[in-house]
């Protein structure tokens, strides 16, 4: 590359025959040598030319030569078939020198005035070559004043000869299991003065196979083996080649995972080169035989190193390795020709023995103990005392290995206790407290814990009671001794239950009236439902139609009797509901503060007195019969009343349960 222009001294001038513009003399010989700077040539043209014409300009002539080459021999005035006169032609030196020779012979038949010529040095455009001549540069030629330089396309580098472009074709590494490689520019002629190295490097265990494809044309020699251009193939085992000529070499099975291909070219020749398609092989793994009820994917004729297959089981079958389940299975062929994992089994899905249903049973429908795919089981609840909650109880063993209901549920059905069952089918007449018989009040709960109180069983693990009855134990739930399934207060034969937690209505304020006098006790275990232990129902929305004024409810408990002692046997009384305004008015005179009776309360009893609940009955249920469902429900909770139970003109006051259904449902669902 030039280091910046160095302008040469200008070269130009005039030449003329001796005596010009007069006639030239005989026997004259004159020689001019013109020299231009390197990279420049000389341009010459004639402004006047008048020499004796002779055959082939033998007599008088002007001869132009550049180096050893004669550019022109000129004579006459006009050109003929055999002689040339310059006319308007311009003459150029071949290099930077031009020799001009003028000669006249011994005689002229008439006078001739000779010649006048002008010359000047001009830049040679080395990049322009005559047709058929080799180009100055392999790729790009750049002319400049006094010289030129060559450059190469991307991927080539200029050889030290400053003209040839050698290919940058070393260091290519092929790692795919198959591919193609070729001489640079294939199928166009490959570059000169190049040394190319290609590497195929596959994982250990693969063997490279080389196939020469399409055409092969590498400069050769008739006697010597590939002296000019050649292709060599080297593996860790042996060398193949050199290859040249026009014949496609045979397939080469290298038995190696690494191959080096070397291609060397010299400065001459015009050949199209070569193309190789390579593939690879490896020791095949045993053909995978799908397990029963499974299939292999993908299916191939053979499986070699790095090839893999997966096993897919039919619906209702699962992948197992022994007892251990697999979500998917893929094995890969290793270099030693073995699979990296053993074949799993496709075993029929087994949902296993179904879970026991609390308060229910399960029946095998498909067959005794059959728990495999598509097997059917039927859950049912213990009749009379339990009913299945929104579920038909039919479960199928599905492909995911879970027992699944017709609604797609995987959880067990729920056996809910039947509520409101009683040996009493109707309310009795209004008369004094009666002894309860077995099964009359199976929801009745006896609460001992400092004082005697009562409650009513809800579902199979909750007790509904009055807030004031359990207020002292709200932070020590385990102190509550809860008994059920007995009529006799002091009997040793009862079902024991213990409290897990006590929930007192947030609106209840102890020692400040009895508004919101309601509480729930969560039992730490479910109780077994039977004819003597059955929950009470919560009121339906329509329940108020069975709780109008004068409708009869039943209160039960072991509270104080008319004799002033706690009852030994469970007692009950049938009492009518009292008009709310009447009840409110009854408790507005001293000693009761105004507003004692709220909208969250209902009153029951006789105006004449004598029939009432009393201390010790607190928290017990005031129940009513829903004549539509024929089930008993809790309408009230024994809360408070006159200082003297059963006093005339006073009434028992009960927490109105229907007002608390959302509160009850929220607590039960949350806990």
């Amino acid at each position: 590359t030039p280091l910046g222009p160095k302008w040469p001294e200008p070269v130009f001038g005039r030449l003329a025959s001796p005596g010009f513009p007069g006639e030239y003399a005989n026997d004259q010989e004159r020689r001019w040598t013109l020299t231009a700077p390197p990279g420049y040539r000389l341009r010459l043209y004639f402004t006047h030319f008048d020499l004796e014409l002779s055959h082939l300009c033998e007599y008088d002539f002007v001869k132009l030569s550049s180096g050893a080459k004669v550019l022109a021999t000129l004579c006459g005035q006009e050109s003929t078939d055999t002689e040339r006169a310059p006319g308007k032609d311009t003459f150029y030196s071949l290099g930077s020198s031009l020799d001009i020779t003028f000669r006249s012979d011994y005689s002229n038949e008439k006078p001739f005035t000779g010649f006048e010529a002008f010359y000047a040095a001009e830049d040679i455009d080395e990049c322009q070559v005559a047709p058929g001549e080799a180009p100055t540069c392999d790729h790009h030629c750049h002319n400049h004043l006094g010289g030129f330089y060559c450059s190469c396309r991307a991927g080539y580098v200029l050889h030290r000869n400053k003209r040839t472009c050698s290919a940058l074709c070393s260091g290519q590494v092929f790692t795919q299991r198959s591919g193609e490689l070729s001489s640079p520019e294939y199928p166009r002629p490959y570059p000169k003065l190049s040394s190319c190295t290609y590497s195929i490097s596959l994982e250990e265990g693969f063997s490279v196979i080389l196939d020469f494809v399409e055409s092969f044309d590498v400069e050769t020699h008739p006697e010597t083996l590939c002296p000019y251009d050649f292709l060599k193939i080297q593996t860790d085992r042996e060398e193949h080649g050199p290859f040249c000529g026009k014949t496609l070499p045979h397939r080469i099975e290298t038995k190696s995972n690494t191959v080096t291909i070397t291609f060397v070219t010299d400065e001459s020749g015009d050949h199209t080169g070569w193309k190789i398609h390579y593939t690879s092989t490896a020791q095949p793994c045993p053909y995978p035989m799908a397990p029963p009820n499974g299939h292999v994917s993908p299916v191939q004729a053979k499986y070699i190193l790095k090839d893999s297959f997966s096993i897919f089981c039919e619906t209702g079958y699962e992948l197992l390795q022994g007892h251990l389940p697999l979500k998917s299975f893929t094995a890969v062929c290793q270099k030693d020709g073995s699979w990296d994992r053993p074949m799993p089994a496709c075993s029929i899905v087994d949902c296993g023995p179904p879970d026991d249903l609390p308060s229910g049973r399960v029946e095998y429908i498909t067959g005794p103990g059959v728990t495999t795919y598509k097997a059917v089981i039927q859950y049912s609840c213990e009749e009379t005392f339990y009913t299945m909650k929104v579920n038909d109880g039919k479960y199928v063993c599905e492909a995911d290995g879970f027992w699944t209901s017709s609604k797609g549920e995987k959880s067990l059905p729920v056996c809910e206790p039947v509520c409101g069952l009683s040996a009493r089918t109707t309310g009795g007449q209004i008369y004094g407290g009666q002894k309860a018989k077995p099964g009359d009040f199976p929801w009745q709960v006896l609460i001992l814990g400092g004082t005697t109180a009562a409650g009513a069983l809800l579902y199979d693990n909750w007790v509904l009671t009055a807030a004031h009855a359990v207020y002292e134990q709200k932070h020590d739930a385990s102190a509550l001794d809860i008994r059920m399934g007995t009529l006799k207060r002091l009997s040793p034969h009862y079902t024991q239950a213990w409290s897990e937690a006590v929930f007192i209505h947030e609106g209840y304020t102890h020692d400040a009236g009895f508004d919101n006098d309601i509480a729930l006790i969560k039992l730490n275990n479910k109780v077994v439902i039977n004819s003597n232990i059955t929950p009470i129902c919560l009121p339906r929305k329509e329940a108020e139609s069975f709780m109008r004024t004068d409708d009869i409810g039943t209160a039960s408990g072991w509270g104080l009797t008319q004799r002033g002692f706690l009852a030994r046997n469970l007692m009950y009384v049938d009492i009518p509901i009292v008009d709310h305004q009447k009840c409110t008015a009854a408790y507005e005179k001293p000693p009761y503060p105004r507003g004692s009776v709220t909208a969250n309360m209902l009153c029951a009893g006789l105006e004449s007195g004598g029939k009432d609940s009393c201390r010790g009955d607190s928290g017990g249920a005031l129940v009513f019969l829903d004549s539509e469902t024929e089930r008993w429900f809790v309408g009230g909770i024994v809360s408070w009343g006159s200082m003297n139970c059963g006093e005339a003109g006073q009434y028992g006051v009960y927490t109105k349960v229907i007002n608390y259904i959302p509160w009850i449902e929220n607590i039960i669902s949350d806990f």
Partner: antibody, heavy 114, light 107 residues
Framework: QVQLQESGPGLVKPSETLSLTCTVS?????????WNWIRQPPGKKLEWMGY???????SYNPSLKSRITISRDTSKNQFSLKLSSVTAADTAVYYC???????WGQGTLVTVSS | EIVMTQSPATLSVSPGERATLSCKAS??????VAWYQQKPGQSPRALIY???YRYSGIPARFSGSGSGTEFTLTISSLQSEDFAVYFC?????????FGGGTKVEIK
Amino acid sequence: QVQLQESGPGLVKPSETLSLTCTVSGYSITSDYAWNWIRQPPGKKLEWMGYISYSGRTSYNPSLKSRITISRDTSKNQFSLKLSSVTAADTAVYYCSRHYGDYWGQGTLVTVSS
Amino acid sequence: EIVMTQSPATLSVSPGERATLSCKASQNVGTNVAWYQQKPGQSPRALIYSASYRYSGIPARFSGSGSGTEFTLTISSLQSEDFAVYFCHQYNENPLTFGGGTKVEIK
């Protein structure tokens, strides 16, 4: 890198419930495999307790079936062991592991004592 | 349940020597057997699964063989770090069971 880590109380009273959690990192417990609980009483051999599979199905050692529950929390990539009504015989190093034991937790010693 | 019986209970071997550990199943378990190495105070380390498949990262000196009821773990040339207790484990059926272990100690 798949890692399993057991956590839970090192001391449990007799008749109470032993609760342990295995936290898995580097692999989702729903992606594949069975996820086991295995224990090793002092100086004794390993005992497989049960597994929960990628799909949430469980399999228990029949000798423990009435007392054992294995569950999982996929949002936390954890699976848990509950063993009820424990006695001194349940004192052991408890391990969680994947499938046929390619990865194990470091183990946690649980002592049953009043 | 399937009982896995390992023998010998203790094996005394010099470094560089070959160790052969045996495990017998009380009934056919196919090839559903794994081998573990356990060092004091550490959790077991998996060596072999499916009777003969070596886990990646496990040195080639460890190899497993057998099927049905008889299984072998071979350590071709014992290194100092190989002295430990080795357990076999069947996962063919519920309950999965383990052998009592073979202690490989320095002779």
